[in-house]
Interface confidence: medium
């Protein structure tokens, strides 16, 4: 019998260029008579053009929704009702070819062609893209608040904020033909629920979405997005009602930046330079293609690429890479944004060099990618350390902390977190090394204590990059480095003269002069520690709630002991900058550290002094007794304390703590407390210091109060941010 053919709606979006008309500002106002008149003519022309081709039998509807420069560009969509079996045959490319063919066939024709009655359409300026019914609905929902803007070369155009009576607005942006548009979004409120989506075309086509951002992101307070060409659309969807624009948008045309380079590396190890996508840190554009060719001076070396918060992974099958595609020596890899450092190590087998290609495979892009490149010794990639094959990083070996996700850095250790005697491979505790007392059979623990040694897990690296054998030599009153750098920056970690309350838990004035109280509207929220004249360190999770993210809310008190009263040694500061660790992850508490820059430098006194920061190699031995201080609750669920409390806690081996917390303890965490519980940090202590006293009498910052199960519960220790695990970031910021 006869079977009705199934028809489907195929939606197309596009633009065409009219050579005999000019754009005017009237055409940006949808309510103007010029706009209504021009759309009527343009609609008619579009319909006639389509119906002049074999697509005519499938024509369903069409609409011209906007105009732009060039001399006049019309932006439109149309729907064809086509038999299902022909759907794939009528791709946007095929439809565009049919329409262009029609236009070309009448260019020199003297015959009357309906669609050419008023418009001279440029065949080369026709663009047809795939769209969907959903895209058209999204477009229509913005037409009540539709803004077209043309931005000329050398201009930076600040866009007018959205109409708050509308629920959605669209900015249609256009620039000069051979340039690309760069959009800058700056969030101006601490919290909002607004949503912004950027498209690589004139309208909100889902398949051409570059990126979407949501809700006054603190992780990215400023976002710069590149289009692949001179057209872009930005769609705003209203969040909470607000009389203030929660963001500022500005746009500028920029020239295409070539992303090709030929480099020859020097005969030295470590980082030698940086490769990045165009206009880094802007998001890379949807049609980015970078090709970097690096020549290595000798086959002794391999090439290392060090990424920041970005990793390369093998992609299963031929699925597209959603966060950038890489080809390195014909190996296809996909980029993946992660909250960790990562290195890709490329063995070199031929002197021809290495070509690295980066491509954005889909229109969806992401933050610009930057990679540091350098050489490593292929026979010894990590001198004195362990090469973690999971992430390509060199990590300390046998220090009692599983730095590598697979834990191999702590396997097959002859001596874990101890010193290995040369004579018989027995293990002695680290504080016994270079202490003037031979503990190994033939005294190998006391050899080479006055000279440079190869760098390793527990050696201290001097400023001149040489290493010394003595563990924890910083600020012990005796220069161990040739350049004396182990005794620099030592105006720290000394307690003020204090009349201690013997056996008590209440601290006295000047006892912990680095202790900070971080307050909002006169209420103590978190602890912190002074580490430099203008910097206080605390926990990132103190700023977890959007309402706590603004610097203007916070006041930092130093030299404080009592919450309900002030004394002469106390000083307060406003916060000029708040920096959370870029890898901080709220759910896992990893990298739970933040830095506050004070609005003016501290004046040091007996009551206000910084604590000493440990070197990355500083070893805080499990079993060591250290101290935590804070105004936190005195019992689980209780109110905060009026007096600054102090309590001694014991450092716990990482493996045991990891077991207790079911392997949620990362290498950036350190545990302290007691198996019986009782002594612990609690709510309100967050961000406060865990300090350990060195033999020199100076106090070093070992940790920051981070998390734990309850307070003082048996079998559950307090978990602290391990300062040695984040020290390189701290130093990078503070210096």
């Amino acid at each position: 019998g006869y079977k009705a053919e199934v028809m489907v709606s195929q939606v197309y979006s596009g633009s065409l260029r009219v050579l005999n008309r000019h754009f005017s500002q009237d055409l940006t106002r949808r309510e103007s008579s010029a706009f209504r008149s021009e759309t009527a003519k343009a609609q008619k022309m579009l319909k006639e053009l389509i119906t002049s081709t074999r697509l005519g039998t499938y024509y369903n509807s069409s609409s011209v929704y906007s105009f732009g420069e060039g001399p006049l560009t019309c932006f439109f969509w149309f729907i064809l009702q086509i038999p299902e079996h022909r759907r794939l045959m009528l791709s946007p490319e095929v439809v565009q070819a049919l329409l262009v063919e029609e236009l070309l066939s009448t260019v020199n024709s003297s015959a009357a062609v309906p669609y050419r009655a008023e418009y001279e359409v440029d065949p080369e300026g026709l663009v047809i893209l795939e769209a969907s019914v959903k895209d058209i609905a999204a477009l229509n929902s913005t037409l009540g608040c539709y803004r077209y803007s043309y931005v000329g070369q050398g201009q930076v155009l600040r866009l007018k904020g959205p109409d708050h009576l509308a629920s959605s607005c669209l900015w249609h942006l256009q620039g000069p033909k051979d340039l690309m548009l760069k959009l800058r979004l700056e969030w101006t409120l601490a919290e909002c629920r607004d949503r912004l989506a950027m498209y690589d075309v004139a309208g909100p086509l889902e398949k051409r979405l570059i990126t979407s951002v949501y809700g006054c992101s603190r992780q990215e307070p400023v976002v710069e997005v590149l289009a692949s060409g001179a057209i872009m659309a930005v769609v705003w969807k209203k969040g909470l009602h607000s009389y203030y624009d929660p963001f500022v948008l500005s746009v500028q045309p920029v020239v295409f930046q070539a992303c090709e380079v030929n480099l020859t590396l020097d005969n030295r190890l470590d980082s030698q330079g940086v490769l990045s996508t165009p206009y880094f840190p802007s998001y890379y554009s949807p049609q980015t293609h970078c090709s970097w060719h690096l020549t290595v001076p000798s086959l002794d070396y391999g090439l290392a690429l060090w990424f920041d918060a970005y990793a390369l992974r093998r992609q299963k099958y031929d699925l597209p890479c959603t966060q950038g595609q890489w080809t390195i020596q014909n190996r296809r890899l996909c980029g993946l944004r992660i909250l960790q450092p990562y290195a890709e190590r490329i063995p070199v087998v031929a002197t021809a060099g290495i070509t690295i290609n980066f491509t954005s495979q889909i229109s969806l892009t992401g933050p610009g990618v930057r990679v540091h490149y350098g050489l490593y010794n292929q026979s010894d990639p990590c001198p004195g350390e362990f090469l973690c094959s999971v992430n390509g990083l060199c990590v300390p070996a046998c220090d009692g902390v599983k730095d590598c996700p697979n834990g191999l850095d702590e396997r097959n250790c002859v001596c874990r977190a101890t010193f290995q005697c040369k004579e018989d491979s027995t293990c002695i505790s680290l504080p016994k090394v270079c202490d003037g007392q031979p503990d190994c059979l033939n005294g190998s623990d006391e050899e080479q204590c006055q000279e440079g040694v190869p760098c390793g897990t527990f050696t201290f690296q001097c400023e001149d990059r040489s290493c010394v054998k003595k563990p924890n030599p910083q600020c012990d009153g005796r220069p161990d480095c040739r350049d004396g750098s182990d005794e620099e920056h030592c105006d720290c970690g000394l307690q003020g003269p204090s009349s201690r309350i013997v056996g008590g838990a209440v601290s006295s004035e000047g006892e912990w002069p680095w202790q900070a109280s971080l307050q909002v509207r006169g209420r103590h929220i978190c602890g912190g520690a002074l580490i430099a004249d203008r910097w206080v360190i605390t926990a990132a999770h103190c700023f977890q709630e959007d309402s706590m993210a603004s610097t203007v809310l916070w006041t930092v008190f130093l030299g404080k002991v009592w919450q309900n009263s002030r004394w002469p040694g106390e000083v307060s500061f406003k916060v000029s900058r708040l920096l959370l660790h870029p890898y901080h992850e709220e759910d896992s508490h990893d990298y739970d550290v933040a830095l506050l820059q004070l609005d003016h430098p501290v004046v040091r006194s007996a009551a206000v002094r910084p604590v000493c920061l440990p070197a990355r190699s500083h070893f805080f031995e499990p079993g060591l007794h250290c101290w935590i201080t804070g105004w936190g609750a005195l019992r689980e669920g209780g109110p905060i304390s009026n007096a600054l409390q102090k309590v001694d806690v014991q450092l716990i081996p990482q493996d045991l703590c990891s077991e207790v917390y079911r392997y949620q303890v990362t290498p950036r965490m350190l545990c302290a407390g007691y198996r019986k519980g009782k002594k612990d940090a609690c709510q309100g202590d967050s961000g406060g210091p865990l300090v350990c006293k060195a033999l020199s009498g100076r106090w070093f910052l070992a940790g920051l109060v981070s998390w734990g199960l309850g307070c003082g519960r048996p079998n559950y220790f307090g978990v602290y941010t391990r300062i040695t695990g984040v020290i390189s970031w701290i130093q990078q910021v503070v210096t």
């Epitope: 716990i652 077991e659 007691y674 198996r675 009782k678 048996p714 079998n715």
Partner: antibody, heavy 124, light 110 residues
């Protein structure tokens, strides 16, 4: 004097059950992890179970898991081992031992006080 | 969990030193610094001699010393005396709150 005294051993048929007790004195019982360790006559020591002071962490050797149950009553300063489905290979001298005392509450996994043991003989 | 490996016997003359070995795996002796040594005289309960690889409980003479290298722990008894004749057992923490013992070494003072 710090002391641990085991009791409850005896001759028992295979497949049956037996309950061992360990009475503690001379120290703060509820501040210590307590272990059961057994020794087959003329053979070595075998750890079989341990229990934390609050009974919230309990562990068993694979050889007894599912058959033996450790428990404690801090009010009575007593430790127990309920042994079900006994086998001939469970024949041994059963010791209870406390974890090493320390100045601070820390992990040691070492036993500094032992009882004299109670003998369990399982006949097949 | 399998037992740690100890040599069945060792001997030495009075005044001499004897070193006992205890071999485990990278998951127990090799991984944790929780190796203990016990001495047991016939018919008596074991006595703790060393904990945490090399620490001596109070009352244990300093003739007894412990050390560790890779997956092997050692107990050295120097200045051997007649009363040191006994069975010696090592133990190690093996993760997940479990403890594993060695098979024991019989020390004879010649």
């Amino acid at each position: 004097e710090v002391q641990l005294v085991e009791s409850g051993g005896g001759l028992i048929q295979a497949g049956r059950s037996l309950r061992l007790s360990c009475a503690a004195s001379g120290f703060t019982f509820d501040e210590h992890v307590i272990y059961w360790v057994r020794q087959i006559p003329g053979k070595g020591l075998e750890w079989i179970s341990s229990i934390s002071w609050k009974s919230d962490i309990i562990a068993y050797a694979d050889s007894v898991k599912g058959r033996f149950t450790i428990s404690r009553d801090n009010a009575k300063n007593a430790l127990y081992l309920q042994m079900n489905s006994l086998r001939a290979e469970d024949t041994a001298l059963y010791y209870c031992a406390r974890e090493k005392d320390g100045d601070f509450y820390y992990y040691y996994f070492a036993m500094d006080v032992w009882g004299q043991g109670t003998t369990v003989t399982v006949s097949s | 969990q399998s037992a740690l490996t100890q040599p069945p016997s060792a001997s030495g003359s009075p005044g001499q030193s004897v070193t006992l070995s205890c071999t485990g795996t990278s998951s127990d002796v090799g991984y944790y610094n929780y190796v203990s040594w016990y001495l047991q005289h016939p018919g008596k309960a074991p006595k703790l001699m060393i904990y945490e690889v090399s620490k001596r409980p109070s009352g244990v003479p300093d003739r007894f010393s412990g050390s560790k290298s890779a997956n092997t722990a050692s107990l050295t008894v120097s200045g051997l005396q007649a009363e040191d004749e006994a069975d010696y057992y090592c133990s190690s923490y093996a993760g997940s709150n479990k403890v594993v013992f060695g098979g024991g070494t019989k020390v004879t003072v010649l």
